[in-house]
Amino acid sequence: MAVTACQGLGFVVSLIGIAGIIAATCMDQWSTQDLYNNPVTAVFNYQGLWRSCVRESSGFTECRGYFTLLGLPAMLQAVRALMIVGIVLGAIGLLVSIFALKCIRIGSMEDSAKANMTLTSGIMFIVSGLCAIAGVSVFANMLVTNFWMSTANMYTGMGGMVQTVQTRYTFGAALFVGWVAGGLTLIGGVMMCIACRGLAPEETNYKAVSYHASGHSVAYKPGGFKASTGFGSNTKNKKIYDGGARTEDEVQSYPSKHDYV
């Protein structure tokens, strides 16, 4: 039950996180005009990964896309790439995790297969979250660097801009959305990886004892069963116990391939 809850919660947290990463990537307010020096401006500038916008006090807002690709700073391109990779990985992770959910039955899928898929999606969520956090952090660093520079615009030279007015930019709402969303995706991924351990079949080394009719010696079969090589169906190695309460020692878990994540 706890495993299902952990897996479900991990999925939901990751889903919210990825939705946040998508939202942050699409948002225009990655950087906003710093109003410290001019708090009474009638024109407010803000910029995103894909376009820059100007909101006039009249209420009119005009946005212009960055129609050049080569003219954009390498850092901005890198941030775009990180965010897109994060979204793609997150989306694939969500797709995989849906099929991995313990509460959803798909044919005769084994728990071991679900565990494998849970682990895969968990890793994908972790990488997705890290990509988003890295992307937002790179952009934030770029802003901090540019804030103290005398250049008027962050994207110097882009589109042949004339640098005549000093406009400083500070952190926009998208950065905070991105950081929180990346963190949630990361947490969701960790939860999926934790859930994966609980989903994996217990592969304990029990000594099988067989009792025979009187007059025969008691045969002890050592070795138990070998660790399965994969997550597929492995009925040959499964032991069926017909009754008898297990002691605490018997139910202890032994290292499996999921422990080394």
Partner: antibody, heavy 119, light 113 residues
């Protein structure tokens, strides 16, 4: 058609108070910033104050700051200018105008209401 | 505050001739974000309310005759009436719409010579 009608002007003694109103129609009043601009007899235009669509931002000219208070009632489509501690130099025709156009330009203007401050 | 200085104070031009009005700002009115200059020109005919002519320093409002044109960037701006008509007799004002307070220039009175 956009219409702005000012009212509330009149003769007032120095130090007195007056409340101007501007009734708007023909556009979504609650979506646009509004301005007051005045013109003293035989003089040029002087911007007085601005209020944003949701009253979140209000700005005043230095000459009226602390004496004039700008407000709006969006459900009633009305703009108000409360003028206190009036001086002789506040004598002017007061226009209300809206930044209905691009570039923060004041496209629509009312016909104006005359305020005379005299003893 | 932004101070706008208009020159000349008055201008007498013959019908059909060019009229040029200058407006100088104490601060740049150029906005880097959209590459636009936040200066507006108004026309006030005798006994009438002001009307908008040009916004963004050079964009004519729809319905304004094309003999009116605005130019300039940063701190220096010009309003040109390419061929003065009788109905153009008015006072012309420039206005800073970049930062509050939204100051006006002193105005230029255009008359027929």
């Amino acid at each position: 058609d956009v219409q702005l009608v000012e009212s509330g002007g009149g003769l007032v003694q120095p130090g007195g108070s007056l409340r101007l109103s501007c009734a708007a129609s023909g556009f979504t009043f609650s979506s646009f910033g509004m301005h007051w601009v005045r013109q003293a007899p035989g003089k040029g235009l002087e911007w007085v104050a601005y209020i944003s669509s949701g009253s979140g931002s209000i700005y005043y000219a230095d000459t009226v700051k602390g004496r004039f208070t700008l407000s709006r009632d969006n459900p009633k489509n009305t703009l108000y200018l409360q003028m206190n501690s009036l001086r002789a130099e506040d004598t002017a025709v007061y226009y209300c105008a809206t930044s209905y156009y691009y570039g923060n330009a004041l496209e629509y203007w009312g016909q104006g209401t005359t305020v005379t401050v005299s003893s | 505050d932004v101070v706008l200085t208009q020159s000349p104070d008055s201008l007498a031009v013959s019908l059909g001739e060019r009229a040029t009005i200058s407006c100088k700002s104490s601060q740049s009115l150029f906005n880097v974000g959209n590459q636009k200059n936040y200066l507006t020109w108004y026309q006030q005919k005798p006994g009438q309310t002001p009307t908008l002519l040009i916004y963004w320093a050079s964009t004519r409002k729809s319905g304004v005759p094309d003999r009116f044109s605005g130019s300039g960037s940063g701190t220096d701006f010009t309003l040109t009436i390419s061929s003065l008509q009788a109905e153009d007799v008015a006072v012309y004002y420039c206005q800073n719409v970049y930062s509050y307070p939204l100051t006006f220039g002193g105005g230029t009175k255009v008359e027929i010579k």
